[in-house]
């Protein structure tokens, strides 16, 4: 199961952690892929490291953990993330946060 | 640019165990972060992945034949090897190599980029 | 698993016209789709990955599209030398597996 806090929100300008978290007796990650909607943020391979999409590059940082921080926010980021799991033996899992970028104080 | 050669007996007996090596040139074994992988062609047939094992160690296999199949790597001699236990005539294929996510961390992608020529094995008494 | 399956198993087209190959998977694999052109006595060589992308060194006239569990390789002017198998696979869920394959051949 994928265990989340589906609604989080941070100050633009500020930065804020992505984080979702998988557990299971019988399968273990092999993989972990973020996107914002439909757009790649990045991928954590287990084998492989980290790929950021370039278009994140300056603004997404990998960690901690299988997480992201997400930093210099904008209003335009304010929407759903999705993290998908890959595991072994096979199985996909997926977990949503909504992220609600405010005007910063 | 990494470079992979199989090797191993074109001929094995059924009930016995198949055993290939691939050799990688052109870079350390231990130094690169991929999977290493074992695909086979039956004659006239499509591809089946058999299965690879990671840079951490893991293993993965194809479910049809996990309980007959062992990957490993021996990083002195820049070598992974496949064992398949128990051949029968039906696993007699090409046997390739070959490597996945060589450009996974610019990119993005896990694909089979890299491919040793492959070596014919039969199963025959 | 999940199953890929290519459509049609032989395509009969002339040196310079289009070819257009179909790959289906039987559950959402987003864009990670591989294809692959294999001709005899050969191995497999990357063409595309990530549904879209042209492999190193592959000419223009390769093109793929398509997300989710429907994809199409389109080779756009047909050459002498794109007369081979074509194989689709899925990566990265467990296990790694590739349609049976389209043979394009000379009409």
């Known amino acids: 199961t994928i265990d989340t806090k589906r609604n989080i929100s941070a100050e633009e300008g500020g930065s804020v952690i992505l984080q979702c978290h998988f557990s299971s007796d019988t399968a273990e990650v092999t993989q972990v892929d973020w996107k914002q909607q439909d757009q790649l943020l990045a991928i954590y391979s287990v084998d492989l490291g980290w790929h950021v999409a370039s278009v994140f590059s300056d603004r997404v940082v990998p960690g901690p953990s299988l997480g992201l921080t997400f930093q210099s926010l904008t209003m335009n980021d304010t929407g759903e993330y999705f993290c998908t799991y890959h595991t072994y033996p096979g199985g996909i899992y997926k977990g949503r946060i909504f992220l609600k970028v405010q005007e910063s104080s | 640019q990494l470079q992979l050669q199989e090797s191993g007996p074109g001929l094995v007996k059924p009930s016995e165990t198949l055993s290939l090596t691939c050799t990688v040139s052109g870079g350390s074994i231990s130094s690169s972060r991929y999977y290493w992988a074992w695909i086979r062609q039956p004659p006239g047939k499509g591809l089946e992945w058999i299965g690879s094992i990671g840079t951490s160690g893991s293993t993965y296999y194809n479910p049809s034949l996990k309980s007959r199949v062992t990957i490993s790597v021996d990083t002195s001699k820049n070598q992974f090897s496949l064992k398949l236990s128990s051949v029968t005539a039906t696993d007699t294929a090409v046997y390739y190599c070959?490597?996945?996510?060589?450009?996974?961390?610019?990119?993005?992608?896990?694909?089979?980029?890299?491919w040793g020529q492959g070596t014919m094995v039969t199963v025959s008494s | 698993e999940i199953v890929m399956t290519q459509s049609p198993a032989t395509l009969s087209v002339s040196p310079g016209e289009r070819a257009t190959l179909s790959c289906r998977a039987s559950q959402s694999v987003s864009s990670n789709l591989a294809w692959y052109q294999q001709k005899p006595g050969q191995a497999p060589r990357l063409l595309i990955y990530g549904a879209s992308t042209r492999a190193t060194g592959i000419p223009a006239r390769f093109s793929g599209s398509g997300s989710g569990t429907e994809f199409t390789l389109t080779i756009s002017s047909l050459q002498s030398e794109d007369f081979a198998v074509y194989y689709c696979?899925?990566?990265?869920?467990?296990?790694?597996?590739f349609g049976g394959g389209t043979k394009v051949e000379i009409k």
């Open positions: 070959a490597i996945e996510g060589a450009n996974f961390r610019d990119f993005g992608y896990v694909a089979f980029d890299i």
């Open positions: 696979q899925q990566s990265p869920p467990w296990p790694r597996t």
